[in-house]
């Protein structure tokens, strides 16, 4: 359960201070220095290729 007033981001996303909204952590692979990537706990899995 989240504490009152915490960022309402779901698993796999992180709050962007610049955009004032939650962003998908998967995009941090391409743009790792985006502000919200600081809040992405684990590296997203590499895309599966045959």
């Amino acid at each position: 359960e989240q504490a009152p007033g915490t960022a309402p981001c779901s698993r796999g996303s992180s709050w962007s201070a610049d955009l004032d909204k939650c962003m998908d952590c998967a995009s941090c692979r391409a743009a790792p220095h985006s502000d919200f990537c600081l809040g992405c706990a684990a590296a997203p899995p590499a895309p599966f290729r045959l």
Epitope: Q2, A3, G5, T6, A7, C9, S14, W15, A17, D18, D20, C28, P32, H33, S34, D35, C37, L38, G39, C40, A41, A42, A43
Partner: antibody, heavy 120, light 103 residues
Framework: QVQLVQSGGGLVKPGGSLRLSCAAS????????MSWVRQAPGKGLEWVSA????????YYADSVKGRFTISRDNPKNTLYLQMNSLRAEDTAVYYC?????????????WGQGTLVTVSS | LTQSPGTLSLSPGERATLSCRAS?????LTWYQQKPGQAPRLLIY???SRATGIPNRFSGSGSGTDFTLTITRLEPEDFAVYYC?????????FGGGTKVEIT
């Protein structure tokens, strides 16, 4: 209990190098971003650097970019700050801190601080 | 981030109002307390949410570029330096601090 224990400070000559360490315990280290903040004697707080939980994203203040490197060893629950090309103005107490992304990037747990003195 | 006043001289029981002004619009602000020889302590996050264990005499408010930390009735242990902090453009930034001292 949740704590951060720092080590590695000391006296270094201008142009020299030093590595600070911050050992974390009492929480799942990989789940949190971490940061370094410094405070020159008698001055205010200055953010230095931050790193994501995975270590894949790093951030630096302009004043240290290209000279300092933040890193983390998640299996060892340890955060590092490698400081190169040190200058007199880098003299400060350095703190490591846990960053809470869901607290809008507030820092809720702090180390005890370690003094870095750059002087000839 | 610009904090004002630089020093606030008050007596225990009085109300303290600390200001933090940003040069550009900020979505959320954080406040810390620091006592001499100690590490900073998180007080307020997300502009107005109190951190764990922080008494309700501390409150934060504001939006855009103007933010305020209010201490309704100063206790002896509240005399310290207070810092605001933002996260913008992938940079964490602190204000210069406001010292709340006993008059």
């Amino acid at each position: 209990q949740v704590q951060l224990v720092q080590s590695g400070g000391g006296l270094v000559k201008p142009g020299g190098s030093l590595r600070l360490s911050c050992a974390a315990s009492g929480f799942t280290f990989t789940s949190y971003a971490m940061s370094w903040v410094r405070q020159a004697p008698g001055k205010g707080l200055e953010w230095v650097s931050a790193i994501s939980g995975s270590g894949g994203s790093t951030y630096y203040a302009d004043s240290v970019k290209g000279r300092f490197t933040i890193s983390r060893d998640n299996p060892k629950n340890t955060l590092y700050l490698q400081m190169n090309s040190l200058r007199a103005e880098d003299t400060a107490v350095y703190y490591c801190a846990r960053v809470r992304a869901n607290y809008y990037y507030g820092m809720d747990v702090w180390g005890q601080g370690t003094l870095v003195t750059v002087s000839s | 981030l610009t904090q004002s006043p630089g020093t606030l001289s008050l007596s225990p029981g009085e109300r303290a109002t600390l200001s933090c002004r940003a040069s550009q619009s900020v979505s959320r602000l954080t406040w810390y307390q620091q006592k001499p020889g100690q590490a900073p302590r998180l007080l307020i996050y997300g502009t107005s949410s109190r951190a764990t264990g922080i008494p309700n005499r501390f409150s934060g408010s504001g939006s855009g570029t103007d933010f305020t930390l209010t201490i309704t009735r100063l206790e002896p242990e509240d005399f310290a330096v207070y810092y605001c902090q933002q996260f913008r453009n992938s940079l964490l930034t602190f204000g210069g601090g406001t010292k709340v001292e006993i008059t």
